[in-house]
């Protein structure tokens, strides 16, 4: 069966309660023409910042064409949760759904979207909208990847040696230096899925007086600099 490509649109806005909200729906440029019978899975990987709100969308099919709308939610270490709406009886049903932050945006007969309020690390998982029509099913799937901004610190720990740490980020941050030095990088994995990256660098060349640690992460990039002193300097700390 024909299926759309994964050209995507990410919309972000501010809600009244000051939480950023993101909605990932298919870009209107993406749809192919001759849809037939059952659509193959259309899946999207979607990174979402922790503590924001997220809205997940179904395919654009009018309610008048539908029999059932189902959201299937598979989170790590939990049984599959399903939220279903049956148009004929105007009833909704939930199975194995315990997270009260995952809800329909509004009444499913008005809006089939799913919302996650205040995204947490535990919301990492797979979300799928299944729209049942008389002629087959339309699917839209999301691999939701929750992003956690690491805390970045930079300090000098001994003569001409600096340490840059990106603490508890998800996924792991990448650390680079300007200028390049003699560096060693270690990663520490935490049980909640976050990673601490520690990069220790030494500069033998004495004409290097200031070094910059650049931390790259999906939530944003951060640069900190420090002057190399003969004795350890002040600690610098920042959030991305």
């Amino acid at each position: 069966a024909a299926q759309p490509n994964n050209s995507l649109m990410l919309q972000t806005s501010k809600e009244n309660h000051a939480l950023a909200s993101s909605s990932l729906c298919m870009d209107e440029k993406q749809i192919t023409q001759n849809y037939s019978k059952v659509l193959a899975e259309v899946n999207t990987s979607w990174p979402v910042k922790m503590a924001t709100n997220a809205v997940l969308c179904c395919p654009p099919i009018a309610l008048r064409n539908l029999i059932i709308i189902t959201w299937e939610i598979i989170l790590r270490g939990q049984p599959s949760c399903t939220k279903a709406y049956k148009k004929e009886t105007n009833e909704t049903k939930e199975t194995n759904c315990t997270d009260e932050r995952i809800t329909w945006v509004s009444r499913p007969d008005q809006n089939s979207d799913l919302q996650i309020r205040t995204v947490a690390i535990t919301h990492d998982g797979y979300y799928r909208c299944i729209m049942v029509t008389p002629d087959g099913n339309f699917h839209r799937g999301y691999h939701l990847q929750v992003l956690v901004t690491p805390e970045v610190t930079l300090f000098q720990n001994r003569n001409r040696t600096a340490v840059c740490k990106a603490v508890a980020g998800k996924p792991a941050a990448h650390i680079s230096w300007i200028p390049e030095g003699d560096c060693a990088t270690k990663q520490e994995y935490w049980s909640n899925g976050t990673v601490t990256v520690k990069s220790t660098c030494h500069w033998e060349v004495h004409n290097v007086s200031t070094v910059t640690c650049h931390v790259s992460h999906l939530t944003g990039n951060k640069s900190l600099y420090i002057e190399l002193l003969p004795v350890p300097g002040a600690k610098k700390s920042a959030k991305l």
């Epitope: 990932l24 969308c57 654009p60 009018a62």
Partner: antibody, heavy 119, light 110 residues
Framework: QVQLVQSGAEVKKPGASVKVSCKAS????????MHWVRQAPGQGLEWIGY????????NYNEKFKGRATLTSDKSTSTAYMELSSLRSEDTAVYYC????????????WGQGTLVTVSS | DIVLTQSPASLAVSPGQRATITCRAS??????????MHWYQQKPGQPPKLLIY???NLESGVPARFSGSGSGTDFTLTINPVEANDTANYYC????????FGQGTKVEIK
């Protein structure tokens, strides 16, 4: 291929009723919503309503409620639009159109049926 | 009901030029990142023909000279470059709730 073939032209007197048919072929008739639209001479398109042959759900433009009746016959894959209490301003070409699922667009139309209301 | 207002009512364009038709909805026809706005072309004695669906998607078999844009309440159909056989009436239509059409734009080729 998908085809919607409508019944022939009709001439009716004011106060009478007319029933226009739309025979579908090339797809499963009960799987798709059918809309009805009319176009008076030299005028634009006016939505009358739709019927879902799967469950016989209907929905009408407020203007036509009580006067238009949409029905379907699954055995012959035919949709019908009946308009009662005809008046001269109902003179128009009446079209059926199939709604496709994705995007709710109308990809297939009947050829149109001219209904003339004249005393 | 959502009211669709098309402008201009008529348009005369020379071949090779650009024709632009706008359609304004009385309230948003967009939801979940999709705009339920479509554009149709109708030539005399024929039923309408779908050109653009969901605001910007080109229907199969329609020349790439036709394009659509917009979201929320404001939408545009563009024909560039215009050809002689583009003489027709053009209608916008929304399908989000109960359905309505714009009043139409007559495009004539000079």
């Amino acid at each position: 291929q998908v085809q919607l073939v409508q019944s022939g032209a009709e001439v009716k007197k004011p106060g009478a009723s007319v029933k226009v048919s739309c025979k579908a072929s090339g797809y499963t008739f009960t799987s798709y919503v059918m809309h009805w639209v009319r176009q008076a001479p030299g005028q634009g398109l006016e939505w009358i309503g739709y019927i879902n042959p799967y469950n016989d759900d209907t929905n009408y433009n407020e203007k036509f409620k009580g006067r238009a009746t949409l029905t379907s016959d699954k055995s012959t894959s035919t949709a019908y639009m009946e308009l009662s209490s005809l008046r001269s301003e109902d003179t128009a070409v009446y079209y059926c159109a199939r709604e496709d699922y994705y995007g709710s667009r109308w990809g297939y139309w009947g050829q149109g049926t001219l209904v003339t209301v004249s005393s | 009901d959502i009211v669709l207002t098309q402008s201009p009512a008529s348009l005369a364009v020379s071949p090779g030029q650009r024709a632009t038709i706008t359609c304004r909805a009385s309230k948003s026809v967009s939801t979940s990142g999709y705009s339920y706005m479509h554009w149709y072309q109708q030539k005399p004695g024929q039923p309408p023909k779908l050109l653009i669906y969901l605001a910007s998607n080109l229907e199969s078999g329609v020349p790439a000279r036709f394009s659509g844009s917009g979201s929320g309440t404001d939408f545009t159909l563009t024909i560039n470059p215009v050809e002689a056989n583009d003489t027709a009436n053009y209608y916008c239509q929304h399908s989000r709730e109960l359905l309505t059409f714009g009043q139409g734009t007559k495009v004539e080729i000079k």
